[in-house]
C-alpha cells in the first residue's frame, strides 16, 4: 500500500484533474473550476470568503503567467503556501510538536 | 471529517515534523533526517537510488539557502516537483483522464 505522503501527492494531482477536466483547457483550472475546487476540497481554507472580488484576487495571485487560468505548477505553489501557513500554525504550538531535540 | 486535499496538506506538514524533530534544529531536516524521510515515506520516488552521491546531489538541490538543511519551504518545493512529475505522467495517459471537455 502507498505510504501516506505518496498518497497525499496522488491526491494533489487527482484533485486538480477532477476540476480542471470540466471546461475549457483540461489541464488548467479556469475561475469557475478553481472556485468549485476551493469550495468543495478546501472549505477550511476558504471559510466565509466566497465573494467575487476575493476569488478574483486569489485567481490573480495564483496566475503568475497571466493567462486567466491556473496550471498545475501554479496550483502546487498555492498548495505549498497553504501548507506553509499550516506549518506556521503547527510550529506555534510546541505541545503539538514531535519531541524536543 | 477533513476533505482528502486538506488531509493531504496535513500529511505533508506532519511528515516533515516526524523527521525534522529527531536531531538538531527541530524545524529543519538535516541530511540523515531527509534520507530517512525519503526512504520510509517516498520509496516509490527513491527507487534504487540509495547511493550517497545521489543523496548529496538531492540535498544540494533542495537546500536553496545553502545552510546544509532543508527547511519547510524547501521541502514544499521538493514535494511540488514530485507532484509535477506525477502530473506529467498522469497527463501522458489520456485514458486515465477526467472526461474530455
Amino acid at each position: 500500500m502507498a505510504c501516506p505522503l505518496e498518497k497525499a501527492l496522488d491526491v494533489m494531482v487527482s484533485t486538480f484533474h477532477k476540476y480542471s477536466g470540466k471546461e475549457g483547457d483540461k489541464f488548467k483550472l479556469n475561475k469557475s473550476e478553481l472556485k468549485e475546487l476551493l469550495t468543495r476540497e478546501l472549505p477550511s481554507f476558504l471559510g466565509k470568503r466566497t465573494d467575487e472580488a476575493a476569488f478574483q484576487k486569489l485567481m490573480s495571485n495564483l496566475d503568475s503567467n497571466r493567462d486567466n487560468e491556473v496550471d498545475f505548477q501554479e496550483y502546487c505553489v498555492f498548495l505549498s503556501c497553504i501548507a506553509m501557513m499550516c506549518n506556521e500554525f503547527f510550529e506555534g504550538f510546541p505541545d503539538k510538536q514531535p519531541r524536543k531535540k | 471529517m477533513a476533505c482528502p486535499l486538506e488531509k493531504a496538506l496535513d500529511v505533508m506538514v506532519s511528515t516533515f515534523h516526524k523527521y525534522s524533530g529527531k536531531e538538531g534544529d527541530k524545524f529543519k531536516l538535516n541530511k540523515s533526517e531527509l534520507k530517512e524521510l525519503l526512504t520510509r515515506e517516498l520509496p516509490s520516488f527513491l527507487g534504487k537510488r540509495t547511493d550517497e552521491a545521489a543523496f548529496q546531489k538531492l540535498m544540494s538541490n533542495l537546500d536553496s539557502n545553502r545552510d546544509n538543511e532543508v527547511d519547510f519551504q524547501e521541502y514544499c518545493v521538493f514535494l511540488s516537483c514530485i507532484a509535477m512529475m506525477c502530473n506529467e505522467f498522469f497527463e501522458g495517459f489520456p485514458d486515465k483522464q477526467p472526461r474530455k471537455k
Partner: antibody
Framework: QVQLQESGPGLVKPSQTLSLTCTVS?????????WNWIRQHPGKGLEWIGH???????NYNPSLKNRLSMSRDTSKNQFSLKLSSVTAADTAVYYC?????????????WGQGTLVTVSS | DIQMTQTTSSLSASLGDRVTISCRAS??????LNWYQQRPGGTLKLLIY???RLHSGVPSRFSGSGSGTDYSLTISNLEQEDIATYFC?????????FGGGTKLEIK
Amino acid sequence: QVQLQESGPGLVKPSQTLSLTCTVSGDSFTNDYYWNWIRQHPGKGLEWIGHIGYGGNINYNPSLKNRLSMSRDTSKNQFSLKLSSVTAADTAVYYCTRESFYDGYPFDYWGQGTLVTVSS
Amino acid sequence: DIQMTQTTSSLSASLGDRVTISCRASQDIRNYLNWYQQRPGGTLKLLIYYTSRLHSGVPSRFSGSGSGTDYSLTISNLEQEDIATYFCQQGNSLPRTFGGGTKLEIK
C-alpha cells in the same frame, strides 16, 4: 482615487540606459495588482513593455526582454523600469499603469505619460 | 503573439449617432478583450473589460460585445466628449497586445 505619476529624464542618448520611476498614490501598493509599463510611439499604437506583481513576479515583452529590467520598492510605493542600449526606435511616451485583478486583467488606471526622446 | 487588428483607423459620425468600432484577434481570446479611450493629447482610460463589462464611472451609452476573435465597441448616442481614439487590447495571454486604434471624428 488611485494616481500614477511617471518620472525620469526626457532625453536619453543612444546606447545609454533609459530609467523611469512610477509613484503610486491613493492606494496601497498591494500584491493584488500588477504594475505595468506601456509605451506609445509618436502617432502610433500601444506596446506593452512588461509588469511586476505578486511576490515580485515579473513578465517582460519578449521583444524587449534582453534590454529590460523592472523592480519595485513597496516602502516608497514605486516601481521602476530600465531599458538599456536605447536607439531612436525607443522614442515614445511611456505610461505606467495598474493592472486590475478582474477577468482579462484590464489596465484600470494610467499615469499621464512621460515623453522620452532618444537623441544625441 | 496575438495580433489585434482594428481595420478602421478613422471614423466620422454625427452627434447623436450610434457608432460601432470593431476589433479582430488573430486567435480566439475567450472574451478577454478590453477597450480604452484616449482623448486628444490625453492619457488612456479603461471603458470596458472582459468584452462587455463597464468600468466604474463609464457612461452607459458605451457597450461591448463579441466572442472568439471578433469584438466591437458601441457608442449608442455620440456626444462631443466621445471624440477620441479607441483601442482594443487582449488580456488572454502574454505579451499583452493592442489594436492600432480607431480615431473617431465629428462629421
